[in-house]
């Protein structure tokens, strides 16, 4: 490969244009930051391949490594690659931006690392500091790479001066993990048991052939020793397991169980602990509260959820009006109880496309041989209001009446309003609210009926208008917690011959 200009380091002017050429006996390509920038590839008559990379309007951000490499399916040797480093001194760019990955450096052992703070100008003096200190650290700097050395578990920043302006880099964080070469995990078949049941714990070590297990447990403190069993898990390399089994647990066996593992070759050790609770008898406890009145909206789906703790696992039943519920074949009701942790459960009743008939008294009961709990609530089905009728009449008494009838659940409120200027109202002028005002212009009479079978309220409201001297748009609006509906009618004076 032949690169012109050959480098290996170039310093170019900001805003300038520069051409890099690479040629070779096979197809060649320029790479920048693991990508191929736009370039012109050609093949000469003598069989030489070339690629021309034109860098236009250069800025400091063009500073960095450029590689020319063979672009050949024959897979030529990887060392057949030329590196060129370009600086574009740019006073507007302090330190070159880093990817997030470069700001965090993770180590497990003492080894040389590089803090990759780079500038656009190879003439700049760059110093390294602990983030909390001013003293420059005596670490060698390479303008193309950054500071390389052995670093403590601290945070660092680089500093430089551009003109008369001091510039700081982003902070770099060195994380050193003091790794134990032993990885221990402890788990229990159950962390909650009843007295008389068994406690079984497992301590597993990975990646070590020769280890020693030592268990600490409440019974041991009273001098009652239990002999653990150690085995090798054959399906996994070097997984060694120690099993501690305590039959017929007593209340005094509650407490912390610790597995300590030592490896004598490198004198490493690690330990993990787990808490075991022995209860006198099983329990079921509700967690959180569910209000005694719940709501669902007609034709929408509603999930009612109860969270509880129990040991041992309970049976869960749901009832509606004292009749047992089950998953319906039509898919209208779905029941599920999930075990979300060892002793925590979530039971859900889902009503699909709720119907009026599903209002009623619901109970969830969770029980086993030792305990039970139940939770009850009333389910109200909310029905959006609708205006069923809006009619106008003018009896002989001379007044005119408008009757509005509608239904909904919960009980709808009724609002009467009128517009006298039909051209401008309601867009430009707000409608006037009507009702039992001190002026005797209008009177209102409203009756409410609850229909037991449909489980909703019916509102009938009659508006009496004393004298109507010009056409009037009267609007009846019904509103409740889940919606509103409006209808309007034009009321004309008696004197007008048309309606």
């Amino acid at each position: 490969l032949v690169v012109t200009p050959p480098g290996p380091e170039l310093v170019l002017n900001v805003s300038s244009t520069f051409v890099l050429t690479c040629s070779g006996s096979a197809p060649v390509v320029w790479e920048r930051m693991s990508q191929e920038p736009p370039q012109e590839m050609a093949k000469a008559q003598d069989g030489t391949f070339s690629s021309v990379l034109t860098l236009t309007n250069l800025t400091g951000l063009d500073t960095g490594e450029y590689f020319c490499t063979h672009n050949d399916s024959r897979g030529l040797e990887t060392d057949e690659r030329k590196r060129l480093y370009i600086f574009v001194p740019d006073p507007t760019v302090g330190f070159l931006p880093n990817d997030a990955e470069e700001l965090f450096i993770f180590l497990t052992e003492i080894t040389e690392i590089t803090i990759p703070c780079r500038v656009t100008d190879p003439q700049l003096v760059v110093t390294l500091h602990e983030k909390k200190g001013d003293v420059a650290l005596p670490v060698p700097y390479d303008h193309q790479r950054g500071f390389s050395g052995i670093f403590e578990d601290r945070s660092y920043i680089c500093k430089t001066t551009i003109g008369d302006r001091e510039v700081d880099s982003d902070a770099y964080y060195v994380y050193r993990l003091q790794v134990s070469s032993i990885n221990v995990s402890v788990n229990a078949v159950q962390t909650v048991v009843r007295q008389g049941e068994n406690i079984t714990l497992m301590c597993i070590v990975i990646g070590n052939e020769v280890v020693n297990f030592e268990w600490t447990y409440p019974r041991k403190e009273s001098g009652r020793l239990v002999e653990p069993v150690t085995d090798f898990l054959l399906d996994m390399p070097y997984h060694i397991r120690s099993i501690l089994h305590i039959p017929s647990a007593e209340l005094e066996d509650s407490g912390t169980y610790t597995c300590n593992v030592t490896e004598s070759v490198n004198d490493h050790q690690d330990e993990k602990a787990i808490n075991i609770t022995v209860v006198e008898s099983g329990y079921v406890r509700l967690l959180g509260e569910v209000g005694t009145l719940q709501f669902a909206e007609l034709h929408r789906s509603r999930t009612l959820q109860v969270v509880f703790e129990a040991y041992p696992p309970p049976t869960v039943l749901w009832f509606k009006d004292n009749r047992t519920l089950g998953d319906s074949s039509a898919g209208e009701i779905a029941l599920s109880t999930r075990n979300v942790s060892e002793t925590r459960y979530v039971s859900e009743l889902t009503l699909v496309r709720v119907k009026v008939a599903e209002a009623g008294h619901y109970t969830m009961r969770a029980f086993h041989e030792d305990a039970e709990v139940q939770l009850s609530f009333q389910l109200q089905i909310n029905v959006p209001v609708r205006v069923l009728e809006l009619s106008e009449s003018h009896p002989d008494s001379g007044e005119q009446t408008v009757r509005c009838r509608g239904r909904g659940m919960p009980q709808p409120n009724i609002i009467w309003s009128a517009c006298r200027d039909l051209k401008r109202c309601p867009r430009e002028l707000p409608p006037t609210l009507l009702g039992n005002s001190s002026e005797e212009e209008s009177q209102l009479e409203t009756n409410v009926t609850y229909w037991e079978e449909e489980q909703e309220f019916e509102v009938v409201s009659t508006l009496r208008l004393q004298h109507v001297d010009r056409p009037l748009s009267v609007r009846c609006t019904l509103r409740n917690a889940v919606g509103q509906d409006t209808q309007e009618v034009i009321v004309v004076p008696h004197s007008l011959p048309f309606k």
């Epitope: 909390k132 578990d153 601290r154 945070s155 964080y173 994380y175 050193r176 993990l177």
Partner: nanobody, 116 residues
Framework: QMQLVQSGAEVKKPGASVKVSCKAS????????IQWVRQAPGQGLEWMGW????????YFAQKFQGRVAMTRDTSINTAYMELSSLRSDDTAVYYC?????????WGQGTLVTVSS
């Protein structure tokens, strides 16, 4: 004293997901990023990404994008890392870590074993 305590070991089947928790104490949880790093048996440390507990903003290493989620619950000072579509080469000890400026602080590690 800053401290991070992680959830216990997990054994999962290929294709499953695992969610590891990391509870912080001894400092203001929202002041420092939480990093997630893993170490497979016999390998070095591999950075997975970070979460800013203050805003909930995250940044993931390209290798894990689309497969990892990092969340936090500031009410209980806990960060979570969930890795989905587990493969056998995801068997590793997963660590959370944070940096107090003067030094780093690490969780005790959570061993995740992926085995059919």
């Amino acid at each position: 004293q800053m401290q991070l305590v992680q959830s216990g070991a997990e054994v999962k089947k290929p294709g499953a997901s695992v969610k590891v928790s990391c509870k912080a104490s001894g400092y203001t949880f929202t002041d420092y990023y939480i990093q997630w790093v893993r170490q497979a048996p016999g390998q070095g440390l591999e950075w997975m990404g970070w979460i800013n507990p203050d805003s909930g903003g995250t940044y993931f290493a390209q290798k894990f994008q689309g497969r990892v989620a990092m969340t936090r619950d500031t009410s209980i000072n806990t960060a979570y890392m969930e890795l989905s579509s587990l493969r056998s080469d995801d068997t590793a000890v997963y660590y959370c870590a944070t940096h107090g400026g003067d030094r780093s602080y690490w969780g005790q590690g959570t061993l995740v074993t992926v085995s059919s």
